[in-house]
């Protein structure tokens, strides 16, 4: 993700306009306060994506953090996000407005917490006070977040001075909550199972010797009870586990499994839940598709990635032109499939220093006994243009014929240009483009051939010059998305005894 301007922090003048652009190889969007403000998304000509957030007539209320995130279906674990923070110093505002629920800060243990009084101007000095006592507290202040520290159960207020005016924030109320010291964790061997497979869920408590386990699970509704097994794992700290095991899962076993743990001696308790899905058959489904044509550049490495979801674990094969691919011993080709979550997979084909011969049709196939998917695309290898020859001939009719031949992928464009002043050519004088001129001084003919075995285009361009009355420097330039190449020749009139 690339944000322009890059940040990470901006201070804007009130009433100004500010434009933020986020660009990436995948669709992106701006988020503010976990929401999507109005923005203009676009796909650029080079295949990248961008989203433009225009903040017009900014006020202090626009102070805050802004995120650029991938607008994709991969979920947070594969999502990247970039943050910037904007200040709009607003002397009329002082502290940013807060909602009443944010003024009550509940602390569950002796950990750092934040009193989120924020100002619009990063230059302002902000102090924290107990409301009853007007002495500033020595707590670090972060202009983007507020005061960060450990706070007692008291009432607090933030203060700053704008000009010669002292400004107070809303009042913040800190409450410590006594919570259970029980540490419960629930995990399942698998949260997705096929009918007929087993469900095993463990509920583990650390550091407590006398605990009571109570399970709730979908089978209870139909009165079919499952007897959990309690497992004592002595050590430091001691662990007690309760294991719920259903050897043959049915579709109706899908749902929430909750483990409630209570300690009878002090009435402390805690519960954790986990969702299990029972499916009729296994599945494989693509989460993303690829463009039909993928581009690689000659001698550069290229990774092609397919993201899919499956259960049970599928086999993955890659094919090129219907032949199975495998990791090459020379390290020119690397295949990898990794499990990024319980049912999500990323399969990658990496072509190291791509060769022309690697162009072709590729297919990834993911399959198991129940289901299969495949994804196919054409790999185009782009090759820089080369001018292979620029030759000259003199037919008897007094014409000069120039023939320019070159190759490249994608198809090169040909441009002919000429320069008459040889001393100043071409550095000090712009060449004049040539083409099919109406005065019939020159005639241009271009033929294009696609060479299947080389997977590249050959361009042959012939330029006929009707009459040349003085020496000319003629340039043939080929150009494609990979670059350009050119050759020059000096053409002299038939009458001049002049050789290059």
């Amino acid at each position: 993700l690339v944000i322009t301007p890059p940040g990470p922090e901006f201070v804007l003048n009130i009433s100004s306009t500010f434009v933020l652009t986020c660009s990436s190889s995948a669709p992106v969007m701006w988020e503010q306060m976990s929401q999507v403000p109005w923005q203009e998304a676009a796909m650029n000509q080079d295949g990248t994506f961008s989203s433009v957030l225009t903040l017009t007539n900014v006020t202090g209320g626009d102070t805050g953090e802004y995120f650029c995130v991938y607008n994709n279906s991969l979920g947070p674990e594969l999502s990247e996000r970039k943050r910037i923070y904007i200040f709009v110093p607003d002397p009329t505002m002082g502290f940013l407005p807060m909602d009443s629920e944010d003024l009550f800060i509940f602390v569950t243990d002796v950990t750092e917490t934040t009193i989120p009084c924020r100002v619009t101007d990063p230059q302002l000095e902000v102090t924290l006070h107990e409301k009853k006592v007007d002495i500033p507290l020595h707590v670090p202040y972060d202009h983007q977040r507020g005061f960060i520290g450990t706070f007692e159960d008291k009432t607090y207020i933030c203060k700053t001075t704008i000009g010669d005016r002292e400004v107070d924030s809303d009042t913040y109320y800190v409450y410590s909550l006594q919570v259970s010291s029980i540490n419960v964790s629930v995990n399942a061997v698998q949260t997705v199972v096929r009918q007929g497979e087993s469900i095993t869920i463990r509920c583990i408590v650390m550091g407590n010797d006398v605990v009571n386990f109570q399970w709730t699970y979908p089978r209870m509704k139909s009165g079919r009870l499952v007897e959990p097994v309690t497992d004592y794992l002595f050590g430091v700290p001691s662990r007690i586990g309760s294991i719920l095991h259903i050897p043959t899962a049915e579709l109706s076993d899908s749902g929430t499994y909750t483990c409630n743990v209570s300690v009878s001696v002090n009435d402390h308790g805690d519960e954790k839940a986990i969702n299990v899905t029972v499916i009729e058959n296994g599945y494989v489904r693509l989460l993303e598709t690829l463009e039909d044509v993928q581009i690689a550049e000659l001698h550069r490495s290229r990774t092609l990635q397919v993201v899919f979801e499956a259960y049970p674990t599928p086999s993955v094969l890659w094919f090129k032109d219907n032949r199975t691919l495998g990791d090459s011993s020379a390290g020119e080709l690397v295949l990898s499939t990794r499990n990024v979550s319980e049912t999500r997979y990323v399969s990658e084909l990496t072509l190291v220093r791509v060769k022309v011969s690697e162009a072709g049709y590729y297919t990834m196939r993911a399959f198991h006994a129940d289901d299969q998917v495949q994804l196919s695309f054409k790999l185009q290898v782009n090759v820089p243009v080369r001018v292979l020859e620029l030759s000259e001939s003199h037919p008897a009719n007094g014409e000069q014929i120039l023939r320019c031949r070159g190759r490249g992928m994608p198809q090169p464009n040909v441009t002919w240009s000429t320069c008459r002043d040889l001393k100043r050519c071409p550095r000090k004088l712009s060449p004049t483009p040539l083409g099919n001129s109406s005065k019939e001084e020159s005639q241009l003919e271009t033929n294009v051939t696609f060479w299947e075995e080389d997977q590249e285009y050959e361009v042959v361009s012939t330029l006929r010059l009707r009459h040349v009355d003085q020496p000319l420097s003629v340039r043939c330039m080929l150009q494609n998305s990979m670059g350009r190449d050119s050759q020059e020749v000096t053409v002299v009139p038939h009458s001049l005894p002049f050789k290059v």
Partner: nanobody
């Protein structure tokens, strides 16, 4: 400057439905996030529902979920609040608000423009 005008309020019985409209003029409506708030006599103004600039996402207060639906018709510069299964506690003046950044939050202080309000009374 954006002007917002609410309409569609009135007196209804418990369990009835009403549809409030909010007509906007003087701005680029399809860039604004739109929200509905309400204020009952003697109470603070409270958030009811909001909708993103493009209608893709919505935000509801817990007490109206499943009963009220917010929508918008950008071509007509209008936002709507469909209220079903009305209760006496829904009696209030309902205000329409617009956020020029396209946000759709429950935070009243984020909204830049407000309508005059329309009275909804649910009688028992």
């Amino acid at each position: 400057e954006v002007q917002l005008v609410e309409s569609g309020g009135g007196l209804v019985q418990i369990g009835d439905s009403l549809r409030l409209s909010c007509a906007a003029s003087g701005g680029t409506f399809n860039r604004y996030g739109m929200g509905w708030f309400r204020q009952a006599p003697g109470k603070e103004r409270e958030f009811v529902a909001a909708i993103r600039w493009d209608g893709v996402d919505t935000n509801y207060a817990d007490f109206v979920k499943g009963r009220f639906t917010i929508s918008r018709y950008n071509a007509k510069n209008t936002a709507y609040l469909q209220m079903n299964s009305l209760k006496p506690e829904d009696t209030a003046v309902y205000y329409c608000a617009a956020d020029r950044r396209g946000l759709y939050t429950k935070h009243a202080h984020r909204y830049d423009y407000w309508g005059q309000g329309t009275q909804v009374t649910v009688s028992s």
